[in-house]
Interface confidence: low
């Protein structure tokens, strides 16, 4: 159950309501838990998790990644620039999360939960952002053709793509989690 839809919250009205920051923190950790479960199935199914990071880096996926200029690192931290990067990055990840939807057998519901929870997280963060104009939304047509291309890959490349998406998304969320705690 995603945070905010927790039945325990209904049963305990005396509990202090979560602040906006706490909700975001909880939401990210919920998604990370989901990614962990998906990674488990992926690693059990293929040997991708054993591949070296260097070997995996040789791919043509344009997955969002934090860079120094994004203002999310300890050195050169910039709250506004960083928040824009987090939201933009999550919006860019959405097409890859859509791709993951048919990639799991035993964790199909978990894949859907990660996708839906990410949409909720984006909404939380957009409320927090002051400079919404700086956030660029990916082009739907470009996303549709990317999705078609990814789905047309052979089995080995699809396994590789699944693994890379999960690892990169975990990395992006983990960086975001800590950066958001400074805001």
């Amino acid at each position: 159950v995603p945070p905010g839809e927790d039945s325990k919250d209904v049963a305990a009205p005396h509990r202090q309501p979560l602040t906006s920051s706490e909700r975001i923190d909880k939401q990210i950790r919920y998604i990370l838990d989901g990614i962990s479960a998906l990674r488990k199935e992926t690693c059990n199914k293929s040997n991708m998790c054993e591949s070296s990071k260097e070997a995996l880096a040789e791919n043509n996926l344009n997955l969002p990644k934090m860079a120094e200029k994004d203002g999310c690192f300890q050195s050169g931290f910039n709250e506004e620039t960083c928040l824009v990067k987090i939201i933009t990055g999550l919006l860019e990840f959405e097409v890859y999360l859509e791709y993951l939807q048919n990639r799991f057998e035993s964790s199909e519901e978990q894949a859907r939960a990660v996708q839906m929870s990410t949409k909720v997280l984006i909404q939380f963060l957009q409320k927090k952002a002051k400079n919404l104009d700086a956030i660029t939304t990916p082009d739907p047509t470009t996303n549709a053709s990317l999705l078609t291309k990814l789905q047309a890959q052979n089995q080995w490349l699809q396994d590789m793509t699944t693994h890379l998406i999960l690892r990169s998304f975990k990395e992006f969320l983990q960086s975001s989690l800590r950066a958001l705690r400074q805001m």
Epitope: D33, S36, Q74, S75, F77, R167, Q174, S175, R178, Q182
Partner: antibody, heavy 122, light 109 residues
Framework: EVQLVESGGGLVQPGGSLRLSCAAS????????MSWVRQAPGKGLEWVSA????????SYADSVKGRFTISRDNAKNTLYLQMNSLKPEDTAVYYC???????????????WGQGTQVTVSS | QSVVTQPSALSVTLGQTAKITCQGG??????AHWYQQKPGQAPVLVIY???SRPSGIPERFSGSSSGGRATLTISGAQAEDEGDYYC???????????FGGGTHLTVLG
Amino acid sequence: EVQLVESGGGLVQPGGSLRLSCAASGFTFSSYAMSWVRQAPGKGLEWVSAINSGGGSTSYADSVKGRFTISRDNAKNTLYLQMNSLKPEDTAVYYCAKEGDTGWKDPMYDYWGQGTQVTVSS
Amino acid sequence: QSVVTQPSALSVTLGQTAKITCQGGGLRSSYAHWYQQKPGQAPVLVIYDDDSRPSGIPERFSGSSSGGRATLTISGAQAEDEGDYYCQSADSSGNAAVFGGGTHLTVLG
């Protein structure tokens, strides 16, 4: 070359106080979170305390909360650990550790000092 | 406080592969980092963020993580790899580091 040099350790009686220092060089000290990690004789590593880059946010292990205070002087490139009400179980080698900059991800330490010995005994 | 569990000791024959595991609920949403410590020396970071290797660390060291379980793999263990290995994660707040109890690796032969 990154260097972290701890000092201020020694023998102290239970209930006494000590102030540890860690002199940092070879990196922009004011840009990085820092921690103290200790190791009791023959035991494993135990995280003690952390402080963010600016010094405005600190956190402590339950075992030292209320007795130890972490601080930093970015102008002097120095990290401190004020230890009060010391107990025999605080006996350990105390390491100063620099947090790696891989974004704001959960703490990871890419450089460690050689440690300073603190012995609490009567 | 989160708990991270790892075996207390492991033996490997020279040139063989050593796998040290680390388990804990916190590893689901936090990264695993690995440190090597030799007697009388400070710990040295050998793997960070589950599977990244700092510069200067030999390629035989690699890491992986899934489902709350992290693994440090030393492919072709050398005599100089003998020592204590610590897994480190973070507590639920993300501010406090949590260390495993350490695994003493012995390289035989």
